[in-house]
Interface confidence: medium
Amino acid sequence: IPVIEPSVPELVVKPGATVTLRCVGNGSVEWDGPPSPHWTLYSDGSSSILSTNNATFQNTGTYRCTEPGDPLGGSAAIHLYVKDPARPWNVLAQEVVVFEDQDALLPCLLTDPVLEAGVSLVRVRGRPLMRHTNYSFSPWHGFTIHRAKFIQSQDYQCSALMGGRKVMSISIRLKVQKVIPGPPALTLVPAELVRIRGEAAQIVCSASSVDVNFDVFLQHNNTKLAIPQQSDFHNNRYQKVLTLNLDQVDFQHAGNYSCVASNVQGKHSTSMFFRVVESAYLNLSSEQNLIQEVTVGEGLNLKVMVEAYPGLQGFNWTYLGPFSDHQPEPKLANATTKDTYRHTFTLSLPRLKPSEAGRYSFLARNPGGWRALTFELTLRYPPEVSVIWTFINGSGTLLCAASGYPQPNVTWLQCSGHTDRCDEAQVLQVWDDPYPEVLSQEPFHKVTVQSLLTVETLEHNQTYECRAHNSVGSGSWAFIPISAGAHTHPPDEFLFTP
């Protein structure tokens, strides 16, 4: 490690004094110190002499001697004070640039160590420091502002008390650069707007960023609007707000509005659409078919989409019959708002009963009037079958009645033996009745059909079965002739309970 003579950490001299600093090392040595006038340098092998015969306050600073060839990089230092009664400060740099949250060293060096007790840091023009400015002072190095913030980008002066009065240094400009994450954040309110001609409207475009240097504007279609800007600063963000107030809207105000903000990192934009209408409107629609078919016992949700302006003043679901005067339970009706002008209304019908088939109407009202949308709900049933033996026009006839929805198809089977249900091996004959007679077909009710099978003579060791089926299921009835008369067998499983 090099050695400096005089071997003291600090040296205090008066202006005009001669100062000689000698550094001796094992190999060649080099001096490093503040850039200042009047120094002469003399090197002789392993020693180097720095000297001046006219020291000034500008020579105040720390002089370091290093040995470039030393692998350990050892150095020695001495701090020189040139105490000038008129110049308490030696400012090494008048501009300091740091990034936010770094420490910023303002290099005003005190020329007299005795003055340390009375030093302070102020902003130029006597302004106090920003609140939360955390700083420390070292007479060798100056003032350090710890974890500098962008807002602390100011001009500073170092102040020292000399003989009861404050003496300021020349100013040091601190530039604290923000680390800007990206373009400004944007909001455009509302996301969509509808107004009747003549009404008032307001559109608010606001942008915020950690840095004050950004631009924001609002444009209508492709025209930039001239709107006064309101500025604010909170939550450590700069905010710029443009508010467009329209007292009486007209059709020319309609169209696309874009809020655009930009900074050095780039541009952000967001848009909304403004509709101007002649009068109030109320539109009801459904993505579902208005004619619904559901199997009995299952559930159904009826959904209505409403587009309205102004907002709804009333709405409800109504059951229009034909079965009973029951009304949908309010707890089964549900409303969700997609956005300001569009809503979805849902009626839940769980585990549908036969008496719940019929017409359901959704009614809504706004200043534009009443509107209704009606659903027709028909329940599907698997067929129920019954067979009787009768004489028609003197001929023995098997009469099969089948009831269900949709309309059942009828098939007759004749099979050998007595059985509850004909299976393939037993079948002797099959007759399809493509056009059974419709006995009843009222809306929302089951369809009842009748099929006749004329039988000249009943074979007593045989079974006659009427089968009916539709899209929901099937039903059957087995007729077994007995010498003592006809015997019928409805299938065990068909005890229909909705």
Epitope: S120, V122, R123, R125, P128, L129, R131, Q154, V212, S231
Partner: antibody
């Protein structure tokens, strides 16, 4: 909530000194500069100077230099303003005011202390 | 020192009507370093201490109604009250703090007609 409670009214002879106190509560006393502003009867506002309660460093308006001394006692969160060599035109209400961010604005004010200088 | 001049010195206003107070400085209050304009507005209601209304040209202080707004640039500034209410009576002061000593305008007395 933030409060600045000042000492009571004073009547002084010309040439005397007066020391007005300002006790802060509801916030960290050392975190905000304190300013002193005065208002002569029926007149406007006049800034006198500031003190940094954290370090005690001060800055006075040139008009009051040599006559005013601003001090603080952090243990009791109190700032003081002493004005010496009083003259009759020093008769005024003296306000302490908290500095919001350093160099103003003054977001909270004391209720004021009336100092009357009369022979 | 920077001289602050307010006009008018007295302002009679009908409740619900707007009001405007002007303030002029003898030199620019714009700090070219940070882009801020160091002008504040205070209201001193009768028998009370001053209270902060607007700071750094246009920022409303906490709790101040949005009917108060500040604007201007360089050396000419305006405080606007969109709809005056009875509680707004008092003396309004502008204050510069671009450099110390801070200086105040002479005040504008707002009274209800």
């Amino acid at each position: 909530q933030v409060q600045l409670e000042q000492s009571g009214a004073e009547v002084k002879r010309p040439g005397a000194s007066v020391k007005v106190s300002c006790k802060a509560s509801g916030y960290t006393f050392t975190g905000y500069y304190m300013h002193w502003v005065r208002q002569a009867p029926g007149q406007g506002l006049e800034w006198m100077g500031w003190i940094n309660p954290n370090r005690g460093d001060t800055n006075y308006a040139q008009k009051f230099q040599g006559r005013v001394t601003m001090t603080r006692d952090t243990s009791i969160s109190t700032a003081y303003m002493e004005l010496s060599r009083l003259r009759s035109d020093d008769t005024a209400v003296y306000y302490c005011a908290r500095d919001l961010e350093g160099g103003g604005p003054f977001d909270y004010w004391g209720q004021g202390t009336l100092v009357t200088v009369s022979s | 020192d920077i001289v602050m001049t307010q006009t008018p010195l007295s302002l009679p206003v009908t409740p619900g009507e707007p009001a405007s107070i002007s303030c002029r400085s003898s030199q620019s209050l714009l700090d070219s370093d940070d882009g801020n304009t160091y002008l504040d507005w205070y209201l001193q209601k009768p028998g009370q201490s001053p209270q902060l209304l607007i700071y750094t040209l246009s920022y409303r202080a906490s709790g101040v109604p949005d009917r108060f707004s500040g604007s201007g640039s360089g050396t000419d500034f305006t405080l606007k009250i969109s709809r005056v209410e009875a509680e707004d009576v008092g003396v309004y002061y502008c204050m510069q703090r671009i450099e110390f000593p801070s200086t105040f305008g002479q005040g504008t007395r707002l009274e209800i007609k």
